[in-house]
Amino acid sequence: CKAMHVAQPAVVLASSRGIASFVCEYASPGKATEVRVTVLRQADSQVTEVCAATYMMGNELTFLDDSICTGTSSGNQVNLTIQGLRAMDTGLYICKVELMYPPPYYLGIGNGTQIYVIDPEPCPDSDF
């Protein structure tokens, strides 16, 4: 297993609709054809997997149907979008990239993107 540098923004504020997008960029040492991207969430020292996708270079990322993540790839960049976020989902979202094929296997883990999620203010009651 060889190490690889992964860069991602330090802080992102989700939209009022609970959507956060950020780029995860990896320094590929070779010509990988199969890449696996995993998003991990760290909050209060606990790490959980948010979503994961394996893709062939040049193809779209395919997450599971019920995943809250979508993404596109371009060269050594993966543009990740996480939706359905609530204020309680605020936390550090870490991008993990694995170059699966061809060998050698490379692993890179980013420093994480702190995603702040603000629940929208409830609308005041109005009379119709």
């Epitope: 802080v11 997008s21 702190q114």
Partner: antibody, heavy 117, light 108 residues
Framework: QVQLVQSGAEVKKPGASVKVSCKAS????????ISWVRQAPGQGLEWMGW????????NYAQKLQGRVTMTTDTSTNTAYMELRSLRSDDTAVYYC??????????WGQGTLVTVSS | EIVLTQSPGTLSLSPGERATLSCRAS???????LAWYQQKPGQAPRLLIY???SRATGIPDRFSGSGSGTDFTLTISRLEPEDFAVYYC?????????FGPGTKVDIK
């Protein structure tokens, strides 16, 4: 080193607007956010809101909603805070601060805005 | 809105003494998002502690933070002359990112 430098003091009349700038250096501007905090004379710190320089999304304190606008210019690594319909109780020192993963650091030197007729 | 209450309002101590400052939140939040700042007259606030207990870069180890849930503490083990200032706690886990009213540490 990481530094935030703010624009100079302003004197405004009630009802006018003010726009304070905060120029960042020493780090990747779009990787972080910028928060704005104000401090009235002899008072404590009041959080006004913040902007994510990565995507331009904003989160404002409810009491200022509709009067405040925070923006960034990523070509010059500068954040701006505009406050409209100024009142005498808006007289304060306005600070910008870099928003990190779980901290506000560093802070700008502050900009005194005086609202007086 | 999470309201932060700091006590005491003023703490009068001598250099070399231990200072214990309290910050209480109106509701429980993540301790990852509690910070302490020091402010001297005419200066901008300076980050001391983030994540309730992590010291910021360049902050002397006489400053320490602790606590979780709704109760947090900033401790200055031995007061130096330059430590006499106002100290604010802040939460930034829930919008709005509120500050406490501050505790003034002055020379007895």
């Amino acid at each position: 080193q990481v530094q935030l430098v703010q624009s100079g003091a302003e004197v405004k009349k009630p009802g006018a607007s003010v726009k304070v700038s905060c120029k960042a250096s020493g780090y990747t501007f779009t990787s972080y956010g910028i928060s704005w905090v104000r401090q009235a004379p002899g008072q404590g710190l009041e959080w006004m809101g913040w902007i994510s320089a990565y995507n331009g999304n904003t989160n404002y304190a409810q009491k200022l909603q509709g009067r405040v606008t925070m923006t960034t210019d990523t070509s010059t690594n500068t954040a701006y805070m505009e406050l409209r319909s100024l009142r005498s109780d808006d007289t304060a020192v306005y600070y910008c601060a870099r928003v990190g993963a779980n901290w506000f650091d560093p802070w700008g030197q502050g900009t005194l805005v005086t609202v007086s007729s | 809105e999470i309201v932060l209450t700091q006590s005491p309002g003023t703490l009068s101590l001598s250099p070399g003494e231990r200072a214990t400052l309290s910050c209480r939140a109106s509701q429980s939040g993540s301790s990852s998002y509690l910070a302490w700042y020091q402010q001297k007259p005419g200066q901008a606030p300076r980050l001391l502690i983030y994540g309730a207990s992590s010291r910021a870069t360049g902050i002397p180890d006489r400053f320490s933070g602790s606590g979780s849930g709704t109760d947090f503490t900033l401790t200055i083990s031995r007061l130096e002359p330059e430590d006499f200032a106002v100290y604010y706690c802040q939460q930034y886990g829930s919008s709005p990112f509120t500050f406490g009213p501050g505790t003034k540490v002055d020379i007895k």
